[in-house]
């Protein structure tokens, strides 16, 4: 045997190496892979080192006997029959209240002649059962809203306006955003007096009813 090369690397059961006929000089990298249905145990990558030994022990190929974790599904909880998903294991998905399952609620891990075990179906989805409406918002003081409904369908927009002499602070239009539950895109706006005139005009009754001192205020204004 040559004393300037690493030892020959054998083939492994249920797998192969690449390159299949490597140069055995220092720096050579050999990768082992397994046939479908088998997984590498140990290091799949070996390197011929300066001291002409391989960097790792020879790996082996072990039969895959379980399915991968099918994952969580948003808006659901799942019931698992076995924690490591061996062949025969089941995962049941149960959608949260307000959601409905599309697809298969129960997945089963099946063995296959060739290849790794596989789930009976893809993970399902949990969809909104319905688009709930948004409850009507009251009109701002000294303002109005349109339309004046108690319930607004998801996607609908309501518009706000203010009485003459008042200006809108906030969003003039807000949308009923679909969701669980549906909700308004912004808080309702308020109507503020456009000037002090507006402020006092809106309170003229208060002024009339107020004690004498307030008339000085009014006169000063």
């Amino acid at each position: 045997p040559r004393n300037d090369t690493c030892p020959e690397l054998p083939e492994i059961p249920n797998g192969w190496k690449s390159p299949s006929q490597p140069e055995l000089v220092h720096g050579t990298v050999v990768t082992y892979q397994c046939y479908p249905g088998y997984q590498v145990v140990g290091s799949s990558v070996l390197m011929c080192q300066w001291d002409l030994t391989w960097s790792e022990d020879l790996p082996s190929c072990q039969r895959v006997t379980s399915c991968h974790d099918p994952g969580d599904v948003e808006h659901s909880r799942r019931l698992i029959s076995s924690p490591k998903f061996p062949v025969g294991a089941t995962v049941q998905y149960i959608c949260d209240q307000g959601f409905v399952l599309m697809g298969s609620s129960i997945l089963t891990c099946h063995d296959r002649q060739a290849g790794s075990p596989k789930w009976s179906d893809r993970a399902p989805k949990c969809l909104l059962e319905q688009l709930k409406p948004c409850h009507g918002l009251s009109a701002p003081e000294n303002g109005a809203r349109s339309p004046e409904k108690q319930l607004h369908p998801a996607g609908a927009t309501i518009h706000f306006s203010c009485a003459p002499g008042y200006v809108l602070k906030g969003q003039a239009s807000i949308k009923c955003v679909p969701g669980h539950p549906s909700h308004w895109s912004d808080p309702p706006p308020i109507c503020r007096a456009a000037s002090l005139d507006g402020f006092y005009n809106s309170r003229s009754l208060d002024v009339a009813k107020a004690p004498a001192a307030s008339s000085t205020l009014d006169a000063a204004h």
């Epitope: 959601f99 409905v100 599309m102 989805k125 059962e129 688009l131 949308k175």
Partner: antibody
């Protein structure tokens, strides 16, 4: 209100790829628990579901057409795009997009008629 | 795939008279959650389909109460208590319980 509008070519040649766009308003394509679907209807015939795309970008296809279809979305533009390869005269149909939740199509676009002819 | 079969194909009705459309599924469309996702759509001439009934018997928002749905398992019916001229079009049943979702072939309602 929730509205959808389809756009795309009126005429495509056999073997070409069809690209259709659905622009939605009144809801976001990222609204959790919702999806948008494409459905088609050949002239004088029944409706056929083609594909769904969900809020989380998961995609489901009609198995009989899966190899020819690709659905995608651009949430920022509120658009869902369907491409269908290797078009044939039998694919002549009105193509609709619709919201999908509650296991039904609640809101539909007005549809776009696509004719496949050389 | 589940096949949805509708009868009749064509239904001529006098305004004010009742109408009934039948839909049969090739297998049970009861969902794993116990509900049945059987819907009815109406496609008026030159328009896109509109949802009338969902989950067998629930009217969608804005649908007049002359429309009603019933049935279970594999047999379902859409009834119109008094047909109006605006009800003309093609009615489709649809199942969403199982993937892929499938439509019936349609029933054309016309005014006599």
């Amino acid at each position: 209100q929730v509205t959808l509008k389809e756009s795309g070519p009126v005429l495509v040649k056999p073997t070409e790829t069809l690209t259709l766009t659905c622009t939605v308003s009144g809801f976001s394509l990222s609204t959790s628990g919702m999806g948008v679907s494409w459905i088609r209807q050949p002239p004088g015939k029944a409706l056929e579901w083609l594909a769904h795309i969900f809020w989380d970008d998961d995609k489901w296809y009609n198995p009989s057409l899966k190899s020819r279809l690709t659905i995608s979305k651009d949430t920022s533009k509120s658009q869902v795009v369907l491409t269908m390869t290797n078009m044939d005269p039998v694919d002549t149909a009105t193509y609709y997009c619709a919201t999908f939740y509650g296991l039904y199509f609640a809101y539909w676009g007005q549809g776009t008629l696509v004719t496949v002819s050389s | 795939d589940i096949v949805m079969t509708q009868t009749p194909l064509s239904l001529p009705v006098t305004p004010g008279e009742p109408a009934s459309i039948s839909c049969r599924s090739s297998q049970s469309i009861v969902h794993s959650n116990g509900n049945t996702y059987l819907e009815w759509y109406l496609q008026k001439p030159g328009q896109s389909p509109q949802l009338l009934i969902y989950k067998v018997s629930n009217r969608f928002s804005g649908v007049p109460d002359r429309f009603s749905g019933s049935g279970s398992g594999t047999d379902f019916t859409l009834k119109i208590s008094r047909v109006e001229a605006e009800d003309v079009g093609v009615y489709y049943c649809f199942q969403g319980s199982h993937v892929p979702p499938t439509f019936g072939g349609g029933t054309k309602l016309e005014i006599k």
